[in-house]
């Protein structure tokens, strides 16, 4: 990605998805009535004109928000503690890697707007998720809906990261 982001960052992202998958506690088939449109800002991760600062910012804010969401008393009561600890550790490592990169990208003079704008959008999205959990009284099904929503949004965000990587590889080889 054009900075000292370790090669295993993509692997860590995939591990996070695997952990979120393993955290499943009840059959999702029981929770259809609790589905909700959280309005994930797809346009933020689907664009073809990917700026390095934008990608870094989206990934950093995503991981920061996931870390916060799964680092609460309510979350500890809902999930298997061993898996939750592994999730926290993995997210913490990825955040450290991304922070190093973000500092470098900002140092290279990339637009501050490319960093602040996605962060605000994602905060609103995650606030909607928190409101939903509270409204549903942190039920097992509410957490299950949120777990699957986070998996979807993280999958889309890491896809965006892979697209930037491919673009960088193509530029490097031409």
């Amino acid at each position: 990605l054009g900075c000292d982001l370790p090669q295993n960052h993509g692997l860590l992202s995939r591990n996070t998805l695997v952990l979120l998958h393993q955290m499943r506690r009840i059959s999702p088939f029981l929770c259809l009535k609790d589905r909700r449109d959280f309005r994930f800002p797809q346009e933020m991760v689907k664009g073809s004109q990917l700026q390095k600062a934008h990608v870094m910012s989206v990934l950093h804010e995503m991981l920061q928000q996931i870390f916060s969401l799964f680092h609460t008393e309510r979350s500890s009561a809902a999930w298997n503690m061993t898996l939750l600890d592994q999730l926290h550790t993995g997210l913490h490592q990825q955040l450290q890697h991304l922070e190093t990169c973000l500092l470098q990208v900002v140092g290279e003079g990339e637009s501050a707007g490319a960093i602040s704008s996605p962060a605000l959008t994602l905060r609103r999205y995650f606030q909607g998720i928190r409101v939903y959990l509270k409204e549903k009284k942190y039920s097992d099904c509410a957490w299950e809906v949120v777990r699957m929503e986070i998996m979807k949004s993280l999958f889309l965000s890491t896809n965006m990261q892979e697209r930037l990587r491919s673009k960088d590889r193509d530029l490097g080889s031409s």
Partner: antibody
Amino acid sequence: EVQLVQSGAEVKKPGESLKISCKGSGYSFTSYWIGWVRQMPGKGLEWMGIIDPSDSDTAYSPSFQGQVTISADKSISTAYLQWSSLKASDTAMYYCARHPGLNWAPDFDYWGQGTLVTVSS
Amino acid sequence: DIQMTQSPSSLSASVGDRVTITCRASQSINRFLNWYQQKPGKAPKLLIYAASSLQSGVPSRFSGSGSGTDFTLTISSLQPEDFATYYCQQAIDLPFTFGQGTKVEIK
């Protein structure tokens, strides 16, 4: 391009076994459930059951529980519907369709072309 | 299981007509209702999801409304390609269930 491609038409005798398939492509196969729907000749749509290919968790309509088995092989992005002992009343068109699970997205937005199963002695 | 009842079971209409099909659920399904169109020998096609959301690529003459137990599919101006069978389906709970279908025929 998202596609669900089903296996070809089958002609079987009562008492025989059968396994039909539905192969997904153009999307993350484990991110969507696969549902199966029956349509008997000249009749309406009947929901049979569903599978989450990420872990092969299944749910069946009470009418089809014990009559059929739904399975999936995520390594080849394929879901299956099988019978251990066919009856003449199993003669129908069978469709697979993808479902977004608990994610908010259109339900059953892509369907297979259907597999016609004919059971006759 | 939640029962879905469609009416009418069939109707005859002309090109340009406004057509309305209703679907009633045996218990509240909030807005978890989908509408499908099926033509002979073809797989069903999703038209409307979540009671009123138009599926991508579906013409705007199709619209859906309702919540709770009573739902409506409206075709504002019937086109030749709209002659088909229409099904509603509840999506709030397993087992998913379909209405018996409404066949729209040429008058």
